[in-house]
């Protein structure tokens, strides 16, 4: 007989989610208003298009990328949408409270929605490590804690290090990856006998995951350039991201074949490695002066991604309980670090070129920023993991991991799949 949604969660989730939504509506009512300044139509459309690109990345790209499980594809896509919708609302309020609140009201602009979508993207990257092992009520908690932690991290970095929006947001890769991995580490790990097949990928869900990867691949230049301050910076960022992701696709497919004894291409490797270049150049996408450098970074990132996908899943499955196909967490943790290291290397080269020890201070500041991002990610991730382990959330039993039927109504199925 098909498994019903647990009664306790049926009581808890709607009440918890709708109460939270009501609270958000009240906060929006009392503390926000729309930007009253008259925008020109052309500028409005251009600004909206960037936001739209980011929403497509989040809803379709990351939504489908995480949908490769044989029996958890519906939940992956829909839960991602749920988290995105909730995350954007909370991120708009939080960003407003942290940056504008002394003025008494939070002014909502298209840019605030853009920032909020990027903040919510962080949750969608992290959640890949825990999808299938948590219910919606737990995901609500994860959204609230992660968006709050990222918002505060960005504010602290902005105030202490005086970094711009772009540099501030580019810690998202490292932050999201380490947050997700630390949450996964706290959750029950062993998959009971008889459920191993559920965390395997299937052809149609894998195809939809590839679709997600394609959407992310197409729009990654928009993500990396969205927060830069001038047209020339944005243009360079778009070019460099495009070259990097183009090369990482070629590297991913050929590297995947190279890594297999029979020369076969792994779908899982390709899903994540195609994005490798975009993550690796993220921090310094506007600083790279020529295509060949961006392409070299794309190549290195692709190789690291394929290498990671080959050797890390065993360790991640054992230590963190992350299934083989959920490779986004450790992939982004490696590539995010690579991106940050590339930026620090550029600063080091400046130091060497100038022969000025004081520039070394900037290197230390950048290392400080990165360390702060990792520490806050790990601490808030562990806190979230501990919260998710509370009995109040009625987490799915280990035997029900990676099972759509726990959460969805399938009228055509009288019995299990």
């Amino acid at each position: 007989m098909s498994s019903k949604y647990p009664r306790s969660v049926r009581r808890c989730l709607p009440l918890w989610a709708l109460t939270l939504e009501a609270a958000l509506i009240l906060l929006f009512y009392f503390f926000t208003h729309y930007d009253a300044s008259l925008e020109d139509q052309k500028g409005l459309v251009a600004s909206y298009q960037v936001g739209q690109d980011l929403t497509v990345m989040a809803a379709i790209g990351l939504g489908f990328l995480t949908s490769s499980f044989r029996r958890h594809s519906w939940s992956s896509v829909a839960f991602n949408l749920f988290m995105l919708a909730l995350g954007v609302q909370w991120a708009i309020l939080l960003d407003g409270f942290l940056s504008q609140f002394p003025s008494g009201k939070v002014v909502i602009t298209l840019f605030s929605i853009r920032l909020a979508t990027m903040s919510a993207l962080s949750v969608l990257i992290s959640v890949d490590a825990v999808l299938g092992k948590v219910n919606l009520a737990q995901l609500v908690v994860m959204v609230l804690v992660e968006v709050t932690a990222l918002g505060n991290l960005r504010m602290v970095i902005s105030n202490i290090f005086n970094t711009d929006y772009h540099m501030n947001m580019m810690h998202i890769y490292v932050f999201a990856a380490y947050f997700g991995l630390s949450v996964a580490w706290c959750l029950p790990k062993p998959l009971p006998e008889g459920t191993e097949d559920k965390d395997q990928t299937a052809t149609i869900p894998s195809l939809s995951a590839m679709l997600g990867a394609l959407f992310l691949w197409m729009f990654w230049p928009s993500f990396n350039s969205a927060l830069l301050r001038s047209p020339i910076e944005r243009k360079n960022a778009v070019f460099n991201t495009y070259y990097a992701v183009a090369v990482s696709v070629v590297t991913a497919i050929s590297g995947s074949s190279l890594a297999h004894p029979q020369g076969k291409i792994s779908k899982t490797y390709v899903h994540s490695a195609v994005l490798a270049g975009g993550v690796a150049v993220g921090t310094s996408c506007h600083l790279i002066p020529s295509p060949w450098l961006a392409m070299v970074l794309g190549l290195v990132a692709g190789l690291i991604s394929v290498g990671g996908a080959k050797y890390l899943p065993g360790c991640c499955n054992r230590v963190l309980g992350i299934p083989h196909s959920s490779i986004m967490g450790y992939n982004f943790s490696l590539l995010g670090l690579l991106g940050e290291i590339i930026y620090i290397v550029l600063l080091v080269l400046d130091t060497v070129g100038a022969g000025n020890g004081m520039i070394g201070f900037q290197v230390l500041l950048s290392i400080g920023e990165l360390s702060l991002a990792i520490v806050i990610a790990l601490m808030s991730g562990l806190l979230t993991g501990l919260l998710l382990n509370l009995k109040i959330w009625k987490a799915p039993h280990e035997a029900k991991y990676f099972d759509d039927q726990v959460f969805w109504k399938f009228p055509h199925l009288a019995v299990g799949f």
Partner: antibody, heavy 129, light 107 residues
Framework: QVQLVESGGGVVQPGRSLRLSCAAS????????MHWVRQAPGKGLEWVAF????????YYADSVKGRFTISRDNSKNTLSLQMNSLRAEDTAVYYC??????????????????????WGQGTTVTVSS | DIQLTQSPSSLSASVGDRVTITCRAS??????LNWYKQRPGKAPKLLIY???TLQSGVPSRFSGSGSGTDFALTISSLQAEDFATYYC?????????FGQGTKVEIT
């Protein structure tokens, strides 16, 4: 020729609000970041706020954060500064300035340099009870 | 915030003199430094950006040097119209700051 003309200054009581405007002409306004800079009587220059070419990025000096709001209307070639909760120390001549961008490359990285190459004549704001 | 300290605060010189004004940053700002000139009752004017690049239309007697924390503006042969207040400005961080100014007066 390239020109910036500020308006909206005047005498205002502490705690009240004022809105400054800056009309731009002679250049493609929508392609450039813009700044507000002020100068208190007998004092030096103080940077106040910046807005990027498309209005997305905004930065404020700590002394005005949460009280002042910079905005722009690219269809009308105007820059604005909404000043709320004014204090006596906000008394100054307020200048709007166009951002000048320049970039050069070494073999391994780009460098973006910015300055303010065109300034308005300034508008005086006096906060006094 | 990055503080800029100019020295001297004021100086007296004659037409034809060579004058150097220095600007020191509280932390390294690479070459992200501009110099402005302001005459009484007038708006400032950009002279030099990126520490040493002369803005178009600015006479070649003005030159800038330095990187990291120590910078200098040099006027090789002072002219009557150069008697003004000079400001340095950093654009390294998102919060731009100016030096307190150096007033160049006629002896």
């Amino acid at each position: 020729q390239v020109q910036l003309v500020e308006s909206g200054g005047g005498v205002v009581q502490p705690g009240r609000s004022l809105r400054l405007s800056c009309a731009a002409s002679g250049f493609t306004f929508s392609s450039y970041g813009m700044h507000w800079v002020r100068q208190a009587p007998g004092k030096g220059l103080e940077w106040v706020a910046f807005i990027s070419y498309d209005g997305s990025n905004k930065y404020y000096a700590d002394s005005v954060k949460g009280r002042f709001t910079i905005s722009r209307d690219n269809s009308k070639n105007t820059l604005s500064l909404q000043m709320n909760s004014l204090r006596a120390e906000d008394t100054a001549v307020y200048y709007c300035a166009k951002e000048h961008g320049y970039y050069r490359s070494s073999w391994y990285r780009n460098y973006y340099y910015y300055g303010m190459d065109v300034w308005g004549q300034g508008t005086t704001v006096t906060v006094s009870s | 915030d990055i503080q800029l300290t100019q020295s001297p605060s004021s100086l007296s010189a004659s037409v034809g003199d060579r004058v150097t004004i220095t600007c020191r940053a509280s932390q390294s700002i690479s070459s992200y430094l501009n110099w402005y000139k302001q005459r009484p009752g007038k708006a400032p004017k950009l002279l030099i950006y990126a520490a040493s690049t002369l803005q178009s239309g600015v006479p070649s007697r003005f030159s800038g040097s330095g990187s990291g924390t120590d910078f200098a503006l040099t006027i090789s042969s002072l002219q009557a119209e150069d008697f003004a207040t000079y400001y340095c400005q950093q654009t390294y961080s998102t919060l731009w700051t100016f030096g307190q100014g150096t007033k160049v007066e006629i002896t």
